[in-house]
Each structure stands twice: as C-alpha cells, then as structure tokens.
Interface confidence: low
C-alpha cells in the first residue's frame, strides 16, 4: 500500500522536511503532490512525468519545494504555515490513480528564557519571592532547576499551575541557591541563566579586630569593625563614648597610654534600618627601657655587709623579676625581696661569690633584662703561703721565694729576714746564696681596703755540697802479723757522718778493726794476708752523700814452708831429675837450691839430666822474701839406684835462724841480693 513518511515529523521552523512515498508501483506514468488531505488542483504543488523527465510546479509551489523522480518532496526553510497534511497522487501507466496522505508539524525554535522576580531584595526569613520564567510561548513546557538539581519537594518552594512561576518562602541570609528555568517544545530545549537572591539581613553584632591584646606605645592602632550585613553596613566609631569617625577602620598613629579606653563600633544597615554595637577595651603600654641595677654598696666585706640591689628605672604597670646565675630567683635566707620586687637585698656574701644578678622588667608588651651585675666582695688577707716550701738549698743556687695571700683587693707584700725588713714585693730573689743566707724568712700580707695584716714564717737552710772523699793510708805495704794500718777518710768536714765499707760490705767492727776520730779513721791491728780489701769510705749529711774510690792494701807475707814436687825420693840411674819448689809469699820469694850443702842455683826449678848414683844426697829448697825479711826452706833426700826399687819420699824443713843450714842460707841470700843489685 502506498504510504507517505515525513522526515522528521516535528520540524523546527526554518529547517527542512522530506516527504517520502513508500510502496510506489512500478510502471509509473508520473505523480502529483498536493497541499492538504485531498486532490485539489488549486493546491497542487507540482507534478512529475517520468517518461519525459518533466517536473512542473503548481499553484501551491512557494519556491521552497523540490520534487524528485523517486516520488519524494523536499520542503526547505519551513514555516509555521507549512504545518499540516500533504497528498501524493500516483498515476500508473494504465492511468489508474493511487493516493496517499502524510503530514508534519512545524514548531518554533524556542528563545533562551530568563527569570523575572517580583522582589529583588527580600529580607531574610520574612519576604517571599515569585520567580517567573519569561517569555510565555505556546506549546511550551516549563521546568525549574535549583542548584542544578531538578526542583526538590520543599515547603519553601511553590509552583504555579502552568509551572511558569516559582515562589520561594522564608529565604535565609546564606541562601546562595541558584535558580534556573527551562523551556521545552518538540524541537528545542532552552535554559535560563542562573539567578540568586540578594537577601537583605543584619547588621549582626559587629566584631572588632584585632582583639584586645595589649598594645605598645609608639605603634599605631588600627581597628577594623565588621558586621555581617546586606547591604554592607555603615560603621561609626566612638572612643569613651565620643564619636570619632564613620569608617570601617579606625586608625590612630603613634599611640600613647592616653589612647587606652573603651572603643565602640556601631554598624548600621540602611536597608533594614537596624543598628548593632560592640565594645572592646584597648590597653596601651609603654615599651619598657632596658633596665639597669644600682647598688648601695659596690664593695661589701665578706660575711659582714648586706648589699641592696635596685632595678631601675621605676615604671608604671611593670612587673619586676630577678635572675640569679641565669636562674629565676629562688627562696634563700641570704636573699630578700621588697614588696614590689624592685629591690633585692643580699646578706652574708661569701668571698667566692661570683653570682651574677640580673633584673627583668615585664609588661604585657615587652620583657627587658638588665646587664648582669656581680658583687666585688672585699676579704682577707688570709694567712699567706710561701712557696716553694722550706726544702734545703745548696750554696751557690738562687733563692726565689713567692708569697701569696687570698685577698681582695690584692694584698701588698713585705719581706723580713731574721726580723729585718728586706723589700715590698710579692717575690723575694737572692742570687748565689751562701750558708749565711740561712735563717727565718717572714712574709707579711696587707689589705689596704680592710686594713688587715697576716704573716707567715719559713725557715731557710743553705748547705754546702760535700766533696768526693778519698782514703789516705799510713802504710801501703804492711807486713802480715806485724804491721798495723791506719786508713783515714779525707777531707775533714763538719756536721758529717763517716761510713766505711770493706769488700763492698758495711764495716763489721772486730777486735782487729778499730774506728776512731768520729769514724773518720779505721785502724787494722796486725794485718793478715786477707785484709787486702777493697776499702771505701763515705761521707754524708742531711743534704748529700758521697763515696770514695776503693783502696786495696798490699799486705806482704811469707814465705810459707816450700813444697818440692814431684814427691818421689828414689830415681833410676839415667833418668832426668826435675824438681820444682813453691812457697806462698807476697811479694813472690827468691828460690835457691842446695845439694848436699852446696848452693847450686837461684831458680824455682832444678833440672839434672841423666842422673847417676853420684847425684844421691840432700836436696834443699831455700825461699826468701825481701819485703818481710823472712825465709824458709825444705830438704828432700834423693837416692839414685841402678836397680828397681820402690820410690819413697822424705823431707826435712827448716825456718827461722840458728841452724847450720840457715847459716848457709843467710850467706847465700846476701850473696844473691848482692848479685841482683849489680
């Protein structure tokens, strides 16, 4: 069946619409479009003959219609009057007609709506406002948006029956709600600009800032008053009840304490006609100067004077505080504060008081602290000390004594030696001292402020250093069992102790060893060969000790009875005879051999080769010590045999004088002595 479709069905004014014929038969001769619901030649828009491709406009053609060979009708730039029905008449080649009717509607493009209000300045929580969506247009739907949300259900919002008017009740001051209206028809949707309500309110109680913090003299006072108000409030300032100015800010440069007082701000709303006031108290304090401390006594005497410290200057509305060694003042029996804390009294001040005192002044705008003050406490002098202490001094050294007494002010010093004034210095210096400088040294300390004196005495001893001692002897070569030896420790020294060592051992006194002359002389009675020493002497006093070099005694002794070796008495004929003689003696003895009474030789060894029986006889060894003047001898009888016989030994000794053998020996000794001196 032949039908007509409108594309689109609802057409916006000024746009175009296309009418399409559907189910058109084949083998068409042509077709004709009419305005309206029926075929009416007077309302023909145009026709189309397919075979000749001829399109002919009709009386209803406005110049905006275009007919196409596919049986479509395009109408451009449509107007409201184009709304309605359109009919197509299709003529087949058999000249049988077919008809169909279609339609469309034309709607205007809506303008952007806007909102009008019956009251632009409602008063909070009092006035209602009617908002109307303009313009009024036909076939239009009206919608409202509140804060970009669709209209909520609220007792404060009411719509008119056509939705074009929205009434808002009880509007609060902080209502920043945005209202928009929307218009709709089938071809357009438009939304207005947002509207917010200018709610009149206030003034509220004004606030003054900054708040009543203390102010410093010399600053400026700049107070700002603010009251929530619409329209903006007008402001009026009153100081202590007197009108000052009608500005939001009150500015007073370089304020003084006279600017303290009651500051009132009045806020006025010209629309609501209301007034509200707020009062603040302003206190102006002078900036405190740096304080300083004065004292009634700059030089107190220890444990005696009290000192009163005062914090200056005295200023109004000021709190005074004291600091002792950087610590807030604590309660003490030695410290006393005045009622206003401005004066601090210090009692019983000890000498070592290095306490520093500071005072602090405070008011609400400033805190200042003084420079520290310490007290100069007078004391002393204490008993002076002399240094170094009274150690003994060696003659030839320098004596340098220093005196010190704790004292403030510093003490003056005076030196006395053995009661005689020497000098007024802290140090006493004597170069190259002698024993004459020994004595009593007194230092006197004087404090010029307290007027006191104190003294101290020290004893100085000067000693001479001992020399190194040496030993002298009355006999360097004593003879054993005959001589006594006297050893003397030199030199003689006063106040000196003498000591002796024998064989590196302290001397043990015995009947043969005697000390005399204050131990300076050591006597050895009847020396023996074991008394050689070494001997040392030492001298000492309280300051030093010295020891001599060792000395040994050359004790002469002997000769002791000689010994002939070997001990054999019998020899074979033809053997060698080799006899050796030895005697203990100092100095070494002289040896002589006598055979059968005849002197043979002056040697310690007697040698005879290839002995025979002729060598039988008495062999005598004679020893002589020229230092002791003593001699000794021994005789050995030797037998020479041709046969074997057991050897034997026999010896005869002789010493001293009076025997024939000794007479011979004496004669030989003289001869020997004479021989050795030529």
């Amino acid at each position: 069946q032949l039908t007509i479709e409108s594309r689109p069905f609802n057409v916006a004014e000024g746009k175009e619409v296309l009418l399409l014929a559907h189910n058109v038969s084949q083998n068409l001769f042509g077709y004709i479009w009419y305005k309206g619901e029926r075929v009416d030649a007077s309302r023909r828009i145009g026709s189309c003959v397919i075979r000749t491709q001829q399109i002919t406009p009709g009386p209803a053609h406005s110049g905006r219609e275009t007919i196409d060979f596919n049986a479509s009708l395009l109408i451009q730039n449509v107007t409201q009057s184009d709304t309605g029905s359109y009919t197509i008449q299709v003529i087949k080649e058999d000249l049988v007609n077919e008809e169909a009717t279609g339609q469309f509607r034309v709607y205007p493009e809506l303008p952007k709506p806007y909102i009008t209000s019956n009251n632009s300045n409602p008063i909070e929580d009092k006035d209602a406002v009617a908002l109307t969506c303009e313009p009024e247009t036909q076939d239009t739907t009206y919608l409202w948006w509140v804060n970009n949300q669709s209209l909520p259900v609220s007792p404060r919002l009411e719509l008119s029956s056509d939705n074009r008017t929205l009434t808002v009740f009880n509007i609060p001051r902080n209502d920043t709600t945005s209202y928009k209206c929307e218009t709709q028809n089938p071809v357009s949707v438009r939304r207005s600009d947002p509207v917010t309500l200018n709610v009149l309110y206030g003034p509220d109680a004004p606030t003054i800032s900054p708040l009543n913090t203390p102010y410093r003299a010399g600053e400026y006072l700049n107070l700002t008053c603010h009251a929530a108000s619409n329209p903006t409030a007008q402001y009026f300032w009153f100081v202590n009840g007197t009108f000052q100015q009608s500005t939001q800010e009150l500015f007073i440069p370089n304020i003084t304490v006279n600017n303290s007082g009651s500051y009132m701000c009045q806020a006025h709303n010209s629309a609501t006609g209301l007034n509200r006031t707020t009062v603040t108290a302003i206190t102006v304090y002078a900036e405190l100067p740096k304080p300083y401390i004065t004292s009634n006594n700059s030089n107190p005497i220890e444990d005696k004077d009290a000192v009163t410290l005062t914090c200056e200057p005295e200023t109004q509305d000021t709190t005074y505080l004291w600091w002792v060694n950087n610590q807030r003042l604590s309660v003490s029996s030695r410290l006393e504060l005045s009622n206003d804390n401005r004066t601090l009294t210090v009692f019983n001040i000890p000498r070592n008081d290095t306490t520093f005192y500071e005072c602090e002044t405070q008011n609400p705008v400033s805190v200042r602290r003084s420079d520290p003050v310490t007290l100069n406490v007078l004391y002393g002098p204490d008993a002076p000390t002399i240094s170094p202490l009274n150690t003994p001094y060696r003659a030839g050294e320098n004596l340098n004594l220093s005196c010190h007494a704790a004292s403030n002010p510093a003490a003056q010093y005076f030196w006395f030696v053995n009661g005689t004034f020497q000098q007024s210095t802290q140090e006493l210096f004597i170069p190259n001292i002698t024993v004459n400088n020994s004595g009593s040294y007194m230092c006197q300390a004087h404090n010029s402020a307290t007027g006191l004196n104190r003294t101290t005495v020290t004893a100085i001893t000067v000693y001479v250093e001992l020399p190194k001692p040496y030993i002298s002897s009355n006999n360097s070569n004593p003879i054993e069992d005959k001589d006594a030896v006297t050893l003397t420790c030199e030199p003689v020294a006063e106040n000196t102790t003498y000591l002796w060592w024998v064989n590196n051992q302290s001397l043990s006194v015995s009947p043969r060893l005697q000390l005399s002359n204050g131990n300076r002389i050591l006597t050895l009675l009847s020396v023996t060969r074991n008394d050689t020493g070494p001997y040392e002497c030492g001298i000492q006093n309280s300051e030093s000790a010295k020891r001599s070099d060792p000395v040994t005694l050359n004790v002469t002794y002997g000769p002791d009875t000689p010994i002939i070796s070997p001990p054999d008495l019998s020899y074979r004929s033809g053997a060698n005879l080799n006899l050796s003689c030895h005697s203990d003696s100092n100095p070494s003895p002289q040896y002589s051999w006598l055979i059968n009474g005849t002197l043979r030789q002056h040697t310690q060894v007697l040698f005879i080769s290839k002995i025979t029986s002729n060598n039988n006889g008495a062999y005598a060894c004679f020893v002589s010590n020229l230092a002791t003047g003593r001699n000794n001898s021994i005789v050995k009888n030797i037998s020479v045999s041709s046969g074997d016989s057991a050897p034997g030994s026999s010896g005869l000794s002789a010493s001293g004088s009076g025997s024939g053998l000794n007479d011979i020996f004496e004669a030989q000794k003289i001869e020997w002595h004479h021989h050795h001196h030529h």
């Epitope: 900054p210 708040l211 913090t213 700049n222 700002t224």
Partner: antibody, heavy 120, light 107 residues
Framework: ELQLVESGGVLVKPGGSLKLSCAAS????????MSWVRQTPEKRLEWVTY????????YYPDTVKGRFTISRDNARNTLYLQMSSLKSEDTAIYYC?????????????WGQGTLVTVSA | DIQMTQSPASLSASVGETVTITCRAS??????LAWYQQKQGKSPQLLVY???TLTEGVPSRFSGSGSGTQFSLKINSLQPEDFGSYYC?????????FGSGTKLEIK
C-alpha cells in the same frame, strides 16, 4: 589570601651558618609583627625570635641569643632568620608566623615550614 | 621563663564524645593563652586566643576557658576532622612558651 612561604632549610654541619627567608603575600606585611617558631623532631614547639612591624624591636630566648638574628625587608615583603654556630639541637622545622594585626600575642598565621638539619 | 604544663599527653576518644585538654602556667598569665590545632604533616592553626576567643571559622563545638594559671580547651561532639595534636601557648610577653602538646586519637 594571606600566604607565608619559607625557604632556605638544608642539611648543615655543627658550627655552620644558614639564612632562612619567608616571603609574605596577600596582606599588608609592613603592618604585622612577625615571629619564627620551630618544631623539634620530638614535635615540641619552640618560639625562636620576634620582630615588630617596623623592625626596630627584636626578642630572642636564651637558647638562641647571640647566635640567631631576625630581620625584615618591608619593601620586599620578606622576613629573614640568620643562624650561626648551629648545634644539633637546632634541628627542627622552622615556621614563619604572623601575629594578629597590631598584636604581638598569638601566632595567627603560619607558613608551611622549612626543615633545617644540623648533623656531622 | 614561664613554663606551660599540658595534660594529658595523649587521649583516645570516639566521634561524638566530649573531651577536655588542660594547660597550667607556672605563674599568673591572666588571660594571655592561645590554643593551636595541628594535623599530621600540616602547620599549626590558631583555634583560641585570650583564653576563650574563638578564631574566625572555628566551629562552636570548641570552647576555651580559664584565667590566671589554669586553662582548658573543651571539644563537644568530636568530629573526624578534630583528631590531631593540640598545643597551648602563653602570649604574656617574651619568651613565648608552648605546652608539650596533647595527641587526640580516634578510639
């Protein structure tokens, strides 16, 4: 909008020196008393120093006296803190603060802070 | 120097509860006391000064009281945004000193 922005905080060795700056905007800087306040790693708040609006009056606690110096350049809207002879106990976040207009009392406005670390 | 002693050092509470933080001055500071709130990683913010005056924008559930040496900060009906650290500070002349802080945590 009143704004305080601190800068200059770094790691510094004990005994060293450092200068912090605070740039102010959005208010009449030359009319406000200013202070530096620091917050230690243990979260304790300590007032460091104060300067009045004209720059003629300064205060310091004993802990920093003689080592720190506060100054301001009202033409440049900038507050400074010169720190010397730094000690490990000076490690903290340093805040630039403005007092209420005409007041030297509470710290009404604070910057975001700058970290100073004193360590060998 | 004036010492400020704050208690408790820490406090756990639930949303909706009421809490009180106290601060004691070592000497009379009249009404020269401020309270600050500090949230994690942020700068301290002034809540109250002159002992009881609320800074502009601070909710009315906060209130300060006291004078002389004893002060307190009360928070009614705790909200989630109230958790953090609170410090008291005297502004009665230099040196200004702070309390050691109270950490308010969610229970």
């Amino acid at each position: 909008e009143l704004q305080l922005v601190e800068s200059g905080g770094v790691l510094v060795k004990p005994g060293g020196s450092l200068k912090l700056s605070c740039a102010a905007s959005g208010f009449a800087f030359s009319s406000y008393d200013m202070s530096w306040v620091r917050q230690t790693p243990e979260k304790r708040l300590e007032w460091v120093t104060y300067i009045n609006s004209g720059g003629g009056i300064t205060y310091y606690p004993d802990t920093v006296k003689g080592r720190f110096t506060i100054s301001r350049d009202n033409a440049r809207n900038t507050l400074y803190l010169q720190m010397s002879s730094l000690k490990s106990e000076d490690t903290a976040i340093y805040y630039c603060t403005a007092h209420y207009f005409g007041s030297s009392g509470p710290f009404a406005y604070w910057g975001q802070g700058t970290l100073v670390t004193v360590s060998a | 120097d004036i010492q400020m002693t704050q208690s408790p050092a820490s406090l756990s509470a639930s949303v909706g509860e009421t809490v009180t933080i106290t601060c004691r001055a070592s000497e009379n500071i009249y009404s020269y006391l401020a309270w600050y709130q500090q949230k994690q990683g942020k700068s301290p913010q002034l809540l109250v000064y002159n002992a009881k005056t609320l800074t502009e924008g601070v909710p009315s559930r906060f209130s300060g009281s006291g004078s002389g040496t004893q002060f307190s900060l009360k928070i009614n009906s705790l909200q989630p945004e109230d958790f953090g650290s609170y410090y008291c500070q005297h502004h009665y002349g230099t040196p200004f000193t702070f309390g050691s802080g109270t950490k308010l945590e969610i229970k």
